[in-house]
């Protein structure tokens, strides 16, 4: 189970993980105390048949070719959490592990 | 965390889970002893902004709008295994739980 890593200079057209730093302050998300920014990454690229398919199911749906099923798309296949300190809606400061904030791997599903 | 369920008569255009029975015999996958067919389901539909987004990350990437990032796509967000009996490449009969064969929920990611 692997995925491609690319950067802004890459010529790769296939599904790939690209670096992206999310800046909460720039978004005006002022309820987030920390981190103010973090490396989130994102997925982009084409999903040719079978390339980086995460699930056997993806292949089976392609074979069955039901009405309206699009081809697989380039999407996160492995994600990880980050620890965040933030204000909730009750003015309380909350510390918690927020799941699925970082893309570790991209694939076609 | 929920997802829409549709069928072939639905007029829903948004990301939805549709029924799909996979027939291994029809595919010519004769190394599979059992099941010969099973309910796999599949995902199809449009991902309007924020609708059924599985991860906060999806929203953040939309905000950051990096080069080449497509919008979220309708993809499995919860899957389950099935038990299968099959021949492996060494002519042995194997019984095992095969992960991610059934789509339980669809979402935008």
């Amino acid at each position: 189970d692997f995925g491609l890593d690319c950067d802004e200079h890459s010529t790769e057209s296939r599904c790939c993980r690209y670096p992206l730093t999310v800046d909460f302050e720039a978004f005006g998300w002022d309820w987030i105390i920390a981190p103010k920014r973090y490396k989130a990454n994102y997925c982009s690229g084409e999903c040719e048949f079978v390339f980086l398919q995460k699930y056997p199911h993806t292949h089976l749906v392609h074979q069955a070719n039901p009405r309206g099923s699009a081809g697989p798309c380039c999407t996160p296949t492995k994600m990880s959490p980050i620890n965040m300190l933030y204000f909730n809606g009750k003015e309380q400061i909350i510390y918690g592990k927020i799941p699925a904030m970082v893309v570790d791997r991209c694939g076609c599903s | 965390d929920f997802g829409l369920d549709c069928d072939e008569h639905s007029t829903e255009s948004r990301c939805c889970r549709y029924p799909l029975t996979v027939d291994f015999e029809a595919f010519g996958w004769d190394w599979i002893i059992a099941p010969k067919r099973y309910k796999a389901n599949y995902c199809s539909g449009e991902c309007e902004f924020v609708f059924l987004q599985k991860y906060p990350h999806t929203h953040l990437v939309h905000q950051a709008n990096p080069r080449g990032s497509a919008g979220p796509c309708c993809t499995p967000t919860k899957m389950s295994p099935i038990n299968m009996l099959y021949f492996n490449g060494k002519e042995q009969i194997i019984y095992g739980k095969i992960p991610a064969m059934v789509v339980d929920r669809c979402g935008c990611s």
């Epitope: 309820w31 105390i33 003015e91 400061i93 | -």
Partner: antibody, heavy 113, light 108 residues
Framework: EVQLVESGGGLVQPGGSLRLSCAAS????????MSWVRQAPGKGLEWVSA????????YYSDTVKGRFTISRDNAKNTLYLQMNSLRAEDTAVYYC??????WGQGTLVTVSS | EIVLTQSPGTLSLSPGERATLSCRAS???????LHWYAAKPGQAPRLLIY???NLVAGIPDRFSGSGSGTDFTLTISRLEPEDFAVYYC?????????FGGGTKVEIK
């Protein structure tokens, strides 16, 4: 960019009064509790007072309770600290803060005869 | 009311050396709400580490935090000239904030 700018500091005699202001920008001011923190010359940081987002509840350290009053005007994005019965030991740089992350640069209050 | 005691009061070290700063709470506190700041003369305090061990974005990774219960530590693995400052631990409970007395890290 979040900015907290304190004003109103200065020299005052013991027993006198002073009102500090803190103008907030770049922050949804009305959504958050705000605090005053001070630092006396050569001493450490001391939390002084806090106020809820609506201004409905206020909190004070024992050293200032009964003498200082914290308030806010959300329409003006401004936090206040009314200081009465000032003592020499109240001499400090007073910081306005949305703890723990956003702080102003501070305003100096000197209590001396 | 929680009291935070920092030690030593002053730490005299040379650039390149390791600094270990202690913060002890009078009773057990939540590690989620124990933070560290750096303060320099004429500047507002700056949040360095949040929730005991998480580095704030932009803070060099030579800074690290650890601890639980009543004992917490800030470590600077190799002191740089810009690291000489006063460091404070701070605890949050409800709307009350408690600061430690500070540790001054000075050039030897």
């Amino acid at each position: 960019e979040v900015q907290l700018v304190e004003s109103g500091g200065g020299l005052v005699q013991p027993g006198g009064s002073l009102r500090l202001s803190c103008a907030a920008s770049g922050l949804t001011f009305s959504r958050y509790p705000m605090s005053w923190v001070r630092q006396a010359p050569g001493k450490g940081l001391e939390w002084v007072s806090a106020i809820t987002s609506s201004g409905g509840s206020t909190y004070y350290s024992d050293t200032v309770k009964g003498r200082f009053t914290i308030s806010r005007d959300n329409a003006k994005n401004t936090l206040y600290l009314q200081m009465n019965s000032l003592r020499a030991e109240d001499t400090a740089v007073y910081y306005c803060a949305r703890l723990p992350d956003y702080w102003g640069q501070g305003t100096l209050v000197t209590v001396s005869s | 009311e929680i009291v935070l005691t920092q030690s030593p009061g002053t730490l005299s070290l040379s650039p390149g050396e390791r600094a270990t700063l202690s913060c002890r709470a009078s009773s057990s506190v939540s590690s989620s709400y124990l933070h560290w700041y750096a303060a320099k003369p004429g500047q507002a305090p700056r949040l360095l580490i949040y929730s005991t061990s998480n580095l704030v974005a932009g803070i060099p990774d030579r800074f690290s935090g650890s601890g639980s219960g009543t004992d917490f530590t800030l470590t600077i693995s190799r002191l740089e000239p810009e690291d000489f400052a006063v460091y404070y631990c701070q605890h949050y409970s409800g709307y009350h904030f408690t600061f430690g007395g500070g540790t001054k890290v000075e050039i030897k």
